[in-house]
């Protein structure tokens, strides 16, 4: 119960953050104007990884596309993939786990399966988290670095009569999306890895005992043991010789193909 | 088609409060638009006091912060103006206008003239 | 506050000829955002409000005629009216729609010579 629990809430904690990256690598506001001592302008600037836009007082909002590849900055190229895989492994991710989840019977798939799954799922919303963690990070970095360049350009050159005043850019609203998602998917990956553990049944260490009866020979393991610490070991109860008698988890009738729960 | 059109005393005693009213026809002042005033005085160049949005976030010109006060009244379809402290130095016209594209201003009352004596 | 410093205050042109009113500001009207110049230009007539021109420095307002135009960037800026006609005849304002408070020019009186 508490596994199913673990890896439902696994999964949707990551589906909320993959969708939040996604948000966020649509979302315009990337980088916004520092209004800094002027908190109302008549003319607002923000930008987006795909496009920047300008807030006029008068409520008009023009976007522009860049609609250029090579002509942009490296590092805006560098968020961009960051972003694109984050989103491609986290889709991949959630369609693995939904497959994988307990809750959900696929035919006669075995537990070692789910579990398996659980844990790809996991690894793949893992490196999504990071993945997006990482780009909003270096856009950040950007922005930092740009801002006190640009701070540094304010102060200098402004002994003539016109002054020309750079718009400096400061974190948007995207970012901290992009965190808490990326925050979501990692911390969503770990609980399906957390799951997995559960989902696999360990091999027991019990030595079989042999019991020398006058008809066949058999071997009887103690059966109804299902350890919860190995991660996706193929550990069903098998029988080791072809004798009458047959272990707890081959005498469980299998749901058949239709039977979803 | 968007019109205007400036409402108030044409005279004002100094030191007394200056009320004036544009009232918005032809459009919905909760259009999202900005709404500013704007006066001139007799002979001279324009000067930006200030706007209101519908939802009644202000903005006012430094110069006479201390002294405006723009309100709306949107069941009207009107906004106000109120200058006190008044001396003859703000006898001037008065237009109500509209911003558009470019923060540029299509849409004018015809004006106002008020008088600032004793 | 942006200063809007107009030249000539006035100026007299022979109908059919070439007007060009000059107007510059203290600082860059200039939005690198979305590579535009926020100044506009009116014309007033007396006994009436301004009418709008062009906006962005370059773009004529719809029902301006196209003998009206406007040109320049950053602090510099120019109206040009390419034939004088009788009725050009009034007072041109050029206006800082880039940060508050808006700022207007001093103007230019346009007469016939």
């Known amino acids: 119960m508490a596994v199913t629990a673990c890896q439902g809430l696994g999964f949707v904690v990551s589906l909320i953050g993959i969708a939040g990256i996604i948000a966020a690598t649509c979302m315009d506001q990337w980088s916004t104007q520092d209004l800094y001592n002027n908190p109302v302008t008549a003319v607002f600037n923000y930008q987006g990884l795909w496009r920047s836009c300008v807030r006029e007082s008068s409520g008009f909002t023009e976007c522009r596309g860049y609609f250029t590849l090579l002509g942009l900055p490296a590092m805006l190229q560098a968020v961009r993939a960051l972003m694109i895989v984050g989103i491609v492994l986290g889709a991949i991710g959630l369609l693995v786990s939904i497959f994988a989840l307990k809750c959900i019977r696929i035919g006669s798939m075995e537990d070692s399966a789910k579990a398996n799954m659980t844990l790809t799922s996991g690894i793949m919303f893992i490196v999504s988290g990071l993945c997006a963690i990482a780009g909003v990070s270096v856009f950040a970095n950007m922005l930092v670095t740009n801002f006190w360049m640009s701070t540094a350009n304010m102060y200098t050159g402004m002994g003539g009569m016109v002054q020309t005043v750079q718009t400096r850019y400061t974190f948007g609203a995207a970012l901290f999306v992009g965190w808490v998602a990326g925050g979501l998917t990692l911390i969503g990956g770990v609980m399906m890895c957390i799951a997995c553990r559960g989902l696999a049944p360990e091999e027991t260490n019990y030595k079989a005992v042999s019991y020398h009866a006058s008809g066949h020979s058999v071997a009887y393991k103690p059966g109804g043991f299902k350890a919860s610490t190995g991660f996706g070991s193929n550990t069903k109860n098998k029988k080791i010789y072809d004798g009458g008698a047959r272990t707890e988890d081959e005498v469980q009738s299998y749901p058949s193909k239709h039977d979803y729960v | 088609q968007v019109q205007l059109q400036e409402s108030g005393p044409g005279l004002v005693k100094p030191s007394q409060t200056l009320s004036l009213t544009c009232t918005v026809s032809g459009g919905s002042i909760s259009s999202g638009y900005n709404w500013h005033w704007i006066r001139q005085p007799p002979g001279k160049g324009l000067e930006w006091i200030g706007y209101?949005?519908?939802?009644?976030?202000?903005n006012y010109n430094p110069a006479l912060r201390s002294r405006v006060t723009i309100s709306v009244d949107t069941s009207k379809n009107q906004f106000s103006l109120k200058l006190s402290s008044v001396t003859a130095a703000d006898t001037a016209i008065y237009y109500c206008?509209?911003?558009?594209?470019?923060?540029?201003?299509?849409?004018w009352g015809q004006g106002t003239t008020v008088t600032v004596s004793s | 506050d942006i200063v809007m410093t107009q030249s000539p205050d006035s100026l007299a042109v022979s109908l059919g000829e070439r007007a060009t009113i000059n107007c510059k500001s203290s600082?860059?009207?200039?939005?690198?955002?979305?590579?535009?110049?926020?100044l506009t230009w009116y014309q007033q007539k007396p006994g009436q409000p301004p009418k709008l021109l062009i906006y962005?420095?370059?773009t004529r307002e719809s029902g301006v005629p196209d003998r009206f135009s406007g040109s320049g960037s950053g602090t510099d800026f120019t109206l040009t009216i390419s034939s004088l006609q009788a009725e050009d005849v009034a007072v041109y304002y050029c206006q800082n729609a880039y940060s508050f408070p808006y700022t207007f020019g001093g103007g230019t009186k346009l007469e016939i010579k």
């Open positions: 206008a509209r911003i558009y594209n470019g923060n540029s201003f299509p849409y």
């Open positions: 600082q860059s009207l200039f939005n690198s955002g979305n590579q535009k110049n926020y």
């Open positions: 209101i949005h519908y939802t009644g976030s202000t």
């Open positions: 962005w420095a370059s």
